[in-house]
């Protein structure tokens, strides 16, 4: 991490991200200072940009549920700082407002 504050996503990406390349996600919430609700998916490759997605979309909900129930070997993230190399496109600086990281749960919630 480069210690920078997390930016707000201003619009949803038109592309989608394959489930198996996603490491975790975090929620962007308007109540915490960002203009739109969003889910930001963090790719396994830390050099790749986060993908900003609409939480109402079915594919987004599926991927979130998958990540929620999958045990993770990752250590919990420190705060909510962006990974080095994250894209700034379509984002607005908002300090650390609106940033809530959800790493994969350690307890599977599956069947």
């Amino acid at each position: 991490s480069d210690g920078g504050a997390q930016d707000c996503c201003l619009k949803y990406s038109q592309r989608k991200i394959p489930a198996k390349v996603v490491r975790s996600y975090r929620k962007q919430e308007p109540s915490l200072g960002c203009s739109i609700p969003a889910i930001l998916f963090l790719p396994r490759k830390r050099s790749q940009a986060e993908l900003c997605a609409d939480p109402k979309e079915l594919w987004v909900q599926q991927l979130m549920q998958h990540l929620d129930k999958t045990p993770s070997p990752q250590k919990p993230a420190q705060g909510c700082r962006k990974d080095r190399g994250a894209s700034k496109t379509g984002k607005k600086g908002k300090g650390s407002k609106g940033c809530k990281r959800t790493e994969r749960s350690q307890t599977p919630k599956g069947p």
Epitope: P18, K56, E57, Q61, Q62, H66, K69, G110
Partner: antibody, heavy 117, light 107 residues
């Protein structure tokens, strides 16, 4: 106990319409996506349609696109499938299934739809 | 549209290992699940996320998924395992597909 109970099946003529319902109980309905899956007599499973938790996002199999509409009423814990312009090949047992991530973890017992003149 | 291909039937001797394959273009890049269906009954989930077992499903059931093939393996096959088995996966557009199904016979 987690349960899904389909209803609304029956005999309908080609070109006709039918609305299936699926009553959910035993779980927080609006925390799950839901799907319809069908099975023609003696044939395999065919996914029909899916809907997101609050009903905003929907997807359909090519075979039913433009004819079938999936919807849900979270206040009634009920999933629906409106089927229009029915064809003989739509004859099947229709199952309601609860989605979690990338799989179906709870299934109903199904309701039979027969399209015949 | 995307298709998943399964053998129509697989036979296994009692107590031996059965393997049911599911072929699809780069299915290994997606998550596969498997369902067991006995005559007159609704399907039951036996494997999800390629290789995870739901509670209540015996350890004899396992799964793998790589490249263009997902595989359901049933070790120490029992008479009660006789059923139709279906693989399934979702694409990135939240469209699902099932394989054609495989009838497992335990000899």
């Amino acid at each position: 106990e987690v349960q899904l109970l389909e209803s609304g099946g029956g005999l309908v003529q080609p070109g006709g319409s039918l609305r299936l319902s699926c009553a959910a109980s035993g779980f927080t309905f609006n925390s799950y996506s839901m799907s319809w899956v069908r099975q023609a007599p003696g044939k395999g499973l065919e996914w029909v349609s899916a809907i997101s938790m609050e009903g905003y996002s929907k997807s359909y199999a090519d075979s039913v696109k433009g004819r079938f509409t999936i919807s849900r009423d979270n206040s009634k814990n009920t999933l629906y499938l409106q089927m229009n312009s029915l064809r003989a090949e739509d004859t099947a047992v229709y199952y309601c299934a609860r989605g979690y991530g990338y799989y179906f973890d709870v299934w109903g017992q199904g309701t039979l739809v027969t399209v015949s003149s | 549209s995307y298709e998943l291909t399964q053998p129509l039937s697989v036979s296994v001797a009692l107590g031996q290992t059965a393997r049911i394959t599911c072929g699809g273009d780069s299915i290994g890049s997606q998550y596969a699940s498997w369902y067991q269906q006995k005559p007159g009954q609704a399907p039951v989930l036996v494997i999800y996320d390629d290789n995870e077992r739901p509670s209540g499903i015996p350890e004899r059931f396992s799964g793998s998924n790589s490249g263009n093939t997902a595989t359901l393996t049933i070790s120490r096959a029992q008479a009660g395992d006789e059923a139709d088995y279906y693989c399934s996966s979702w694409d990135m557009d939240a469209v699902n597909v099932f394989g054609g199904g495989t009838k497992l016979t335990v000899l």
